[in-house]
Amino acid sequence: VPPGEDSKDVAAPHRQPLTSSERIDKQIRYILDGISALRKETCNKSNMCESSKEALAENNLNLPKMAEKDGCFQSGFNEETCLVKIITGLLEFEVYLEYLQNRFESSEEQARAVQMSTKVLIQFLQKKAKNLDAITTPDPTTNASLLTKLQAQNQWLQDMTTHLILRSFKEFLQSSLRALRQM
């Protein structure tokens, strides 16, 4: 159950309502737990977690990455620039999260939960951001053709793509969480 949708929260009126920052924090933690579960299935199902041929698949991907210039790391930390990067990056990840749907057997619901929780996280962060004009939304047509291209890959590349998406998304979220906790 995503944070804030727990029936126990309703039954505990004495508990302080979550602040916006706490809600974002919990949401990211929830998504990270989901990624962790999905990674377990990926690693159990194939040997992708041990593979050294990642570069082959990485050429097809343009996964969002944090760089020093984005202002999210300790060096050159900039709250506003970083927040824009986090939201932009999450919006760019959405097409890859769509690709992850139907890539899991026993964790199908978990994959859906990660996708839906990310949409909610984006909404939370957009409310927090002051400079929404700086946020570029990915082009739906480009996303559609990327999705088609990824789904047309052979089985090995699809497995590797799944593994790389989870790894990159985990790293992006973890860096985002650290940055948000400094804000």
């Epitope: 990674r39 944090m66 790293e171 860096s175 650290r178």
Partner: antibody, heavy 119, light 107 residues
Amino acid sequence: EVQLVESGGGLVQPGGSLRLSCAASGFTFNDYDMAWVRQAPGKCLEWVASITPSGGGTYYRDSVKGRFTISRDNAKNSLYLQMNSLRAEDTAVYYCARHGYTLDYFEYWGQGTMVTVSS
Amino acid sequence: DIQMTQSPSSLSASVGDRVTITCLASEGISNDLAWYQQKPGKAPKLLIYDATRLQDGVPSRFSGSGSGTDFTLTISSLQPEDFATYYCQQSYKYPWTFGCGTKLEIK
């Protein structure tokens, strides 16, 4: 089995440099943030620096910022700590440690390598 | 930086005793707290993370509790191999900081 093996420690004069290495095995190295944690003789544990899985992001404690550089080579499953302008207060056992998969505790530790800064 | 204060700094107990060590954070850290055990000349070993979650392979006599600023490590029935120094660490925000340890000695 997760293994972290540090090397490169030794005796160095104040102002000198040293490069520590950590060889990792038994896990998918580029899935994890890695760190250096130190412990001066008879003292508390002190986090020194961390690096993200891709190597794109780094974090340092204030007292080493600008003097120490953490880096990694994912192709070699290796972590490094370049230590410049060393001071007496940097004397400690330096441990290589692996962060948790999604959380910032230190799940596995190496046996440590001793760095002594003295004239 | 978040300061972590451990108490007591040392503690004498006997095999079979129930022991409690506390850790106080200078600001709220949610449940982002870990506990480690360290024996002389050895590296620390993770016991508990996320305040309450037991690391794989750690005996169930170890347990953690707390949230926010106040945390506790409990050993329900001390065993001879438990005599060591215990450290808490906040994993909430960098710089990640440790308590200065609680040395558990044989009475």
